[in-house]
Interface confidence: low
């Protein structure tokens, strides 16, 4: 589709190699050497078969919603640089990425940037911070299970220790203690009661479960598993899941412009 009458301004895509830990954001910058009047900028990932899968796009001063809301494109104030970010990168986001620009008619042309490689590394265990970060994707080694079991064991040991200390300090108080509310004072949902909210982390990759192909649910374009993690006293963040047919939320864009299609 290249035509000789309109020289193409090159694209850059940087950094050429990017390494982030899982759960962190990974950001590439796609830069146009100059700004054509009318263009579409696409962000692609190379599939194992060397095909380009379109992740998201920028066209005519609007961001085209990606098929996965984790992939975001943002135009920078200078007009020629675009941040292409993966929010909360997963291990399986590792791969080759590039951006591609399409001049719109009458002189339709396509140009691709050089490839860049993203490596998403397994998160190293760190002391917990104030705000919980998205949980790392559970690896085939059942890393999460190991951590969970360890946490439970430590918790049980601490409880036993606490019980022992209480028994030693208050020997009478521990005898015949009732853990339920008294009849004349029912449990109240007042300021003292700590409400339990759910914090939805969205889609997690449960690798140890073999997914069997089955017909998708009528309104969900993809069968995904949702993980809801419970925290005390945190505001709820409901998982929003718009189906393609409801025409709300992220819509599936046409893949016809990947690469070099549409009409836009």
């Amino acid at each position: 589709l290249d035509s000789p009458d309109r020289p193409w301004s090159p694209l850059t895509f940087s950094p050429a190699q990017l390494t982030v830990q899982e759960g962190e954001n990974a950001t590439f910058t796609c830069s146009l050497a100059d700004i054509p009047d009318s263009f579409v900028l696409n962000w692609y990932r190379l599939s194992p078969r060397n095909q380009t899968d379109k992740l998201a796009a920028f066209q005519e001063d609007r961001i085209e919603p990606g098929r996965d809301r984790r992939f975001r494109v943002m135009r920078l104030p200078n007009g020629r640089d675009f941040h292409m970010s993966i929010v909360a990168a997963r291990l399986n986001d590792s791969g080759i990425y590039l951006c591609g620009a399409i001049y719109l008619p009458p002189n339709t042309q396509i140009n691709e940037s050089p490839r860049a490689e993203l490596s998403v590394t397994e998160r190293t265990l760190e002391p917990p911070t104030q705000s919980p970060s998205p949980p790392p994707r559970l690896s085939g080694q059942l890393q999460g299970l190991v951590i969970g079991v360890t946490s439970v064991l430590v918790g049980v040991l601490l409880l036993l220790l606490l019980t022992w200390v209480l028994a030693a300090v208050f020997p009478r108080a521990t005898r015949g203690a009732c853990v339920c509310g008294s009849e004349d004072e029912p449990l109240k949902e007042g300021p003292d009661a700590a409400p339990v909210f759910t914090l939805d982390y969205g889609e997690l990759d449960f690798q140890w479960r073999e997914k069997t192909p089955e017909p998708p649910a009528p309104c969900a374009p993809e069968q995904t598993e949702y993980a809801t993690i419970v925290f005390p006293g945190r505001p709820a963040s409901p998982g929003r899941r718009a189906s393609a047919s409801s025409l709300q939320g992220a819509q599936p864009p046409s893949p016809e412009d990947g690469p070099g299609l549409w009409p836009l």
Partner: antibody, heavy 120, light 111 residues
């Protein structure tokens, strides 16, 4: 009510040209791409090309690139397809159809079709 | 070009019976949760009618006897209980890349 009303089908001699029209109503004209699909007698569906009414941008099947011209008249909510250098094998019913420009949900409305016969 | 192969080429079904049509693409038309494959029915002398879009989503006004499934290269259109009105030619179509192509069609007749 969404409608795509077609006209322009005719009996044309080989080597001639034809201009088919597709008048759209009942929706915002510039919010949907318009495509042309043809169907030879007793055969399947074949995509010809598409036009973006908001800016006149077009794309084509390689087979029709050199002979087909797609255009729109926004004031009349009308899309046109001109097909040149007609041959007997261009005899077919020609359909215009639309697709939402914001997302790809397939071709949700079709014109009634117009028959083009190429014969000497 | 992506080639869509439909099977069977024709199908004869009794009213009330289920029916299913397969469409196989020469390369994957799916990514990140969306499959760019659509199903149409065409009755004699009429334009095609969209039944299912994006592989599994029922177009408004289409009876829920129709359902679509599949991803990657293999897709299926199912009619849970065929009615006399379902006779016609069924086509799959992809919109993954240019050129857009259709399957060759499956003719469904009612016994």
């Amino acid at each position: 009510e969404v409608q795509l009303v077609q006209s322009g089908g005719d009996l044309v001699k080989p080597g001639g040209s034809v201009r088919l029209s597709c008048v759209a109503s009942g929706y915002t004209f510039t919010s949907y791409y318009l495509y042309w699909v043809r169907q030879a007698p007793g055969k399947g569906l074949q995509w010809i090309g598409g036009v973006n009414p908001s800016n006149g941008g077009t794309n084509f099947s390689e087979k029709f690139k050199s002979r087909a011209t797609l255009s729109v008249d926004k004031a009349k909510n009308t899309a046109y397809m001109q097909l040149n250098s007609l041959r007997a094998e261009d005899t077919a019913v020609y359909y215009c159809t639309r697709r939402d420009s914001n997302y790809d949900g397939g071709f949700d409305y079709w014109g009634q079709g117009t028959l083009l016969t190429v014969s000497s | 070009d992506i080639v869509l192969t439909q099977t069977p080429p024709s199908l004869s079904v009794s009213p009330g019976e289920p029916a299913s049509i397969s469409c196989r693409a020469s390369k994957s038309v799916s990514t990140s949760g969306f499959s760019y494959l659509h199903w149409y029915r065409q009755k004699p002398g009429q334009p095609p009618q969209l039944l299912i879009f994006l592989a599994s989503n029922l177009e408004s006004g289409v009876p829920d006897r129709f359902s679509g499934s599949g991803s990657g290269t293999d897709f299926t259109l199912r009619i849970s209980r065929v009615e006399a009105d379902d006779a016609g030619v069924y086509y799959c179509q992809h919109s993954w890349e240019l050129p857009l192509t259709f399957g060759q069609g499956t003719k469904v007749e009612i016994k």
